[in-house]
Amino acid sequence: GPVWRKHYITYRINNYTPDMNREDVDYAIRKAFQVWSNVTPLKFSKINTGMADILVVFARGAHGDFHAFDGKGGILAHAFGPGSGIGGDAHFDEDEFWTTHSGGTNLFLTAVHEIGHSLGLGHSSDPKAVMFPTYKYVDINTFRLSADDIRGIQSLYGDPKENQRLPNPDNSEPALCDPNLSFDAVTTVGNKIFFFKDRFFWLKVSERPKTSVNLISSLWPTLPSGIEAAYEIEARNQVFLFKDDKYWLISNLRPEPNYPKSIHSFGFPNFVKKIDAAVFNPRFYRTYFFVDNQYWRYDERRQMMDPGYPKLITKNFQGIGPKIDAVFYSKNKYYYFFQGSNQFEYDFLLQRITKTLKSNSWFGC
């Protein structure tokens, strides 16, 4: 059956049961994911907006799939195997009484079972397994996966050691707070900012100081290291990633099939062999592509280059250039341009630099 073809998996709690405090729901779901991340290379991250891989839903009766709930008792929950759209989603019957303890139906225990399905596990015939088809309360403080559960999930994803990086002195993880740190590409992805460098990316969740480093291959195994440019069209849940003369399309954090494609399909002349940086401006519905000391402007609606390009970067972005490493769009009025270890906040309405920063200023360095 199917599995997630990446190790970084997002989840979102769509709505909350009134039976429990929101914090208790968050905690139960987080701990349930942790049960599986403890024994695999998988990493789970909760997002609050946008498309998550796994959507957690509390619903009663008919709720948009073929499997209407049946009132109190009977079916407690169900979850879909890995995949796009509804794939991975976990639905909990709101007609049950959800609890943190042995009364009613324990959300944590039920969630561990359902997340097992979300990750690709079927039912187990071992009555001691959490994947056994019938619900039975066990003390959640001493709860452990059975050997059968662990065998099953590790047959799909391997054990946690497979997530640990082998030392690679030629391509080791860059020091995040090195004052000379530069980035290959930067883009927003929903409420996050992705910073690419060599074979790594850092994930910065807006307004939070905490960041995490990941291997590009752990999120997108089919993508190369050394991403050179990236941009997001948030309204379409699309991210475009560029390396050399090729680009990849990521939809809802999943690579689309039939990629990479040639950058020349955008309309670049043949002499353009790579893109240095790219940024999409949703106000104008245009993407700006930066190549050496020039830039092109692409109409995403008409799917063609605007006439009159390329233009010089220095001529139209006062104080920026002649070349840039990376750029992203934020807060509805700023481009953040990266040149080596420096970063420039550029107000595209005023058409001038409003702040000069270090490239790693986003990380509280």
Partner: antibody, heavy 122, light 103 residues
Amino acid sequence: EVQLLESGGGLVQPGGSLRLSCAASGFTFSWYWMHWVRQAPGKGLEWVSGISPSGGYTMYADSVKGRFTISRDNSKNTLYLQMNSLRAEDTAVYYCARDIVGPYSAGLFDYWGRGTLVTVSS
Amino acid sequence: DIQMTQSPSSLSASVGDRVTITCRASQSIYTYLNWYQQKPGKAPKLLIYAASSLQSGVPSRFSGSGSGTDFTLTISSLQPEDFATYYCQQAGIFGQGTKLEIK
């Protein structure tokens, strides 16, 4: 390349029976939910029936419940629809459609056959 | 049972126009809504799944939005090949269809 090819349609009298087949290729048939969807002449789409990957779980629209039976033979990569007690209102093009993998059906029909016409008339 | 109401039932537009079709569910279906295109004599084709995800191979002028009960299919700039009938769907329920015709 995913392909679905329906067969078995034709003209049948009211009260008669017909068995439709859908031959699948280009994917691991035994992993996927499969469905029948029909379309009466000049009308919209109507879901008819669905079956789980193993064949152990079946679902029917109220309009065909008790008259139609969906089944599958995973060794032959084939989906079936046995239609009994046919009525004039069952006249339609019948499409087979592929759904997702897994224990539950999403009703996400990503590949469709070309359809086979069933005409119920005296 | 959940009902799906699609509007309008027919629509005339010209090449290059921006077109919007809406679909309303009688109760929340979260983001579990799909859109299909069907041309005369052909099988339906999946365009958008999970309300806003573009099916592979579908041109990016098609987009979907919405969650809960209200959903929209938008074609940003109509092309000649887009004149067809469009259906929304969740589980076993299809909308009545919207026939998009050339003005």
